[in-house]
C-alpha cells in the first residue's frame, strides 16, 4: 500500500547570519487531505514557524505555490536569519478533521546551525631565500570559520603535497576556529615560476573552496655558474674576454673584472637575458690590450649574487707573438 | 498561449547518455508556479511519467529510472531538460515534454520526439 | 506505484453509440485521476481532470466520474473523430501513473 512520504533532505542546514535559509519538504502524495505546517522543535512546547492559513510569520516566504492543488512541495525560505533561529525544524502533514486537523505523519527534520566561512587563506613563505634542492617551509592561515570541520589541501603547481602539518584552534567548542598550516616544499632549480597553493574547504563554502597562493620567487635563490672564455680573434692589440654568468635567479648580481689582481674601473659591455624558467643569463665583454713585451695576464671575473659570497673564475692569458694555449681555474 | 517543443539527438549509441530540451514559448517558465514534466511512450505501448520539476528546482524522479535520470530547468532559456544515462534498446520510445497545470492535469505537451537506441 | 487497471483493453463501437471506459486503483485516491485522448501519431490531449472537471475546449458528450479507487469514463455519443486510444492517470501518489490504454475503433 502506497504512502505518503514527508522528505527533508538535509539533516544539517549550515546558514549564516542574517542570510535567507531555505528549509526543503516535499510530499508523495496529495493524501490525506489537510495542510502541512512547519514546527521548530517536538513535544508540546514545539514553536509554530509557519501556517499556511492562520498566523502572521512576516520573515517566512513560501518557495512554491501552496494554493495549487497539485502542489507537493512545502519548502520555506526564513530570512534574516539571527543566533535565536537555530533548532531543528519539522514539517508536518496534518489531516482534516472535524472539529480540527489531526497529525497524520512528520518530516525527519532538518537541524538549523550557524554556520561562518572561513577567512580567505593567507600564505606565506620563508624570510630568507633559500638555494634549490633545500626545503623550505610555507605556512597558510584561515580563520572565523564554524563549524570546526575543514579540509585543507597544499598543492605545487597544481601537484597534492603531502609533507604538511596542519592544526586547528581551539579544540574545544567555540563559536569560530582557525586553522594553520604548515607545508615542507623541496625546491627545484626550475622553480623561480612556480606556485604553492594552499586551498581551504568548508561547508559554508558549497563545494568552492578558497585558496590562497606564495610564488617561489620569493623564497628561491638560484646561484649562478660562471665561464670565462677568450675570443678566438684578436683585433689589433686588444683581446676579447667574455665572462658568461649563467642561469642565475633573482636578478640582483654585481660583476667586477680584475686584471692581475687590480680591480678595473673601466666600463665593460654587457647583455642581460630572461629564460624560459626565469632564470637570468648576464654576458660581460672585456677587452684586455696587450703588447708582445707584457707579461702575462690573469684576467677574474667576480660576480657577487643576491648578497651572497662573491664566486669568481679566472683566465690566464698567455699572450706571445704566436697565441699559446689558454688556461682558466675557479677560485671560490 | 503556451506551447512545448522537444529538441535533441534522435539516436543514441547503447551506454551514452540521452539529451532532450523543451524549449517553453508563449509564456514564462516560472511564472505560473507549474510543474514541468517529462513523459515517454515504448512503439506500441502506454504512457510512462518519467518525471517532473518546478522552477523551485524540487523534482520527483520515476523509482523505476530515478538512478539514471536528471531533470533540470534552465529559467533564462525558458526551457527545462531530460538526461538519461546508460541507455540500453528499452529506451527506445517517444519522449514527450508536457506542463502538469494549475488543475494537476497535463494540459499542453510537446509533440513528442522519437529516440532510437542503437549502435 | 499506485496500478491503474484500464478496461477493456480496446473496443469497437458505431457511430452515436455511448462508451464507457473504466479505470481502477490499486488504492483509494480519492478524485485526483485525469483522463486523456491520444490519437495516432499525436501527443496526448487532456480531456478530464480532477476525475469529473471538463478541460478547457473539450466537447461535452465526454464525462468523467467515480472517486475512491473506480472511476468511470464516458463518451455520451461516438463520433468518427473520436477514434482514438483513451488513458486514465492517478496524480494522489508519485510516481504518476497510466492505465494501459483502452484503443476506441468505429464499426
Known amino acids: 500500500e502506497e504512502e505518503l512520504q514527508m522528505i527533508q533532505p538535509e539533516k544539517l542546514l549550515l546558514v549564516t547570519v542574517g542570510k535567507t535559509a531555505t528549509l526543503h519538504c516535499t510530499v508523495t502524495s496529495l493524501l490525506p487531505v489537510g495542510p502541512v505546517l512547519w514546527f521548530r522543535g517536538v513535544g508540546p512546547g514545539r514553536e509554530l514557524i509557519y501556517n499556511q492559513k492562520e498566523g502572521h510569520f512576516p520573515r517566512v516566504t513560501t518557495v512554491s505555490d501552496l494554493t495549487k492543488r497539485n502542489n507537493m512541495d512545502f519548502s520555506i525560505r526564513i530570512s534574516s536569519i539571527t543566533p535565536a533561529d537555530v533548532g531543528t525544524y519539522y514539517c508536518v502533514k496534518f489531516r482534516k478533521g472535524s472539529p480540527e486537523n489531526v497529525e497524520f505523519k512528520s518530516g525527519p527534520g532538518t537541524e538549523m546551525a550557524l554556520g561562518a566561512k572561513p577567512s580567505a587563506p593567507v600564505v606565506l613563505g620563508p624570510a630568507a631565500r633559500t638555494t634549490p634542492e633545500h626545503t623550505v617551509s610555507f605556512t597558510c592561515e584561515s580563520h572565523g570559520f564554524s563549524p570546526r570541520d575543514i579540509t585543507l589541501k597544499w598543492f605545487k603547481n597544481g601537484n597534492e603535497l603531502s609533507d604538511f602539518q596542519t592544526n586547528v584552534d581551539p579544540t574545544g567548542q567555540s563559536v569560530a576556529y582557525s586553522i594553520r598550516s604548515t607545508a615542507r616544499v623541496v625546491l627545484d632549480p626550475w622553480d623561480v615560476r612556480s606556485q604553492v597553493i594552499c586551498e581551504v574547504a568548508h561547508v559554508t563554502l558549497q563545494g568552492d573552496p578558497l585558496r590562497g597562493t606564495a610564488n617561489l620567487s620569493e623564497a628561491i635563490r638560484v646561484p649562478p655558474t660562471l665561464e670565462v672564455t677568450q675570443q678566438p680573434m684578436r683585433v689589433g692589440n686588444q683581446v676579447n674576454v667574455t665572462c658568461q654568468v649563467r642561469k642565475f635567479y633573482p636578478q640582483s648580481l654585481q660583476l667586477t673584472w680584475s686584471e692581475n689582481g687590480n680591480v678595473c674601473q673601466r666600463e665593460t659591455a654587457s647583455t642581460l637575458t630572461e629564460n624560459k624558467d626565469g632564470t637570468y643569463n648576464w654576458t660581460s665583454w672585456f677587452l684586455v690590450n696587450i703588447s708582445d713585451q707584457r707579461d702575462d695576464v690573469v684576467l677574474t671575473c667576480q660576480v657577487k649574487h643576491d648578497g651572497q659570497l662573491a664566486v669568481s673564475k679566472r683566465l690566464a692569458l698567455e699572450v706571445t707573438v704566436h697565441q699559446k694555449d689558454q688556461s682558466s681555474d675557479a677560485t671560490p | 498561449q503556451v506551447q512545448l517543443q522537444e529538441s535533441g539527438p534522435g539516436l543514441v549509441k547503447p551506454s551514452q547518455t540521452l539529451s532532450l530540451t523543451c524549449t517553453v514559448s508563449?509564456?514564462?517558465?516560472?511564472?505560473?508556479?507549474?510543474?514541468w514534466a517529462w513523459i515517454r511512450q515504448h512503439p506500441g505501448k502506454g504512457l510512462e511519467w518519467i518525471g517532473y520539476?518546478?522552477?523551485?528546482?524540487?523534482?520527483y524522479y520515476n523509482p523505476s529510472l530515478k538512478s539514471r535520470v536528471t531533470i533540470s530547468v534552465d529559467t533564462s532559456k525558458n526551457q527545462f531538460s531530460l538526461k538519461l544515462s546508460s541507455v540500453t534498446a528499452a529506451d527506445t520510445a517517444v519522449y514527450y515534454c508536457?506542463?502538469?497545470?494549475?488543475?494537476?492535469?497535463?494540459?499542453?505537451w510537446g509533440q513528442g520526439t522519437t529516440v532510437t537506441v542503437s549502435s | 506505484d499506485i496500478q491503474m487497471t484500464q478496461s477493456p483493453s480496446s473496443l469497437s463501437a458505431s457511430v452515436g453509440d455511448r462508451v464507457t471506459i473504466t479505470c481502477q486503483a490499486s488504492q483509494d485516491i480519492s478524485n485526483y485521476l485525469n483522463w486523456y485522448q491520444q490519437k495516432p501519431g499525436k501527443a496526448p490531449k487532456l480531456l478530464i481532470y480532477?476525475?469529473?472537471n471538463l478541460a478547457t475546449g473539450v466537447p461535452s458528450r465526454f464525462s468523467g466520474s467515480g472517486s475512491g479507487t473506480d472511476f468511470t469514463f464516458t463518451i455520451s455519443s461516438l463520433q468518427p473523430e473520436d477514434i482514438a486510444t483513451y488513458y486514465c492517470q492517478q496524480f494522489a501518489y508519485l510516481p504518476w501513473t497510466f492505465g494501459g490504454g483502452t484503443k476506441v475503433e468505429i464499426k
Open positions: 508563449g509564456g514564462s517558465i516560472s511564472s505560473g508556479g507549474d510543474y
Open positions: 480532477d476525475a469529473s
Open positions: 508536457a506542463r502538469e497545470g494549475y488543475h494537476s492535469g497535463m494540459d499542453v
Open positions: 520539476i518546478y522552477p523551485s528546482g524540487f523534482t
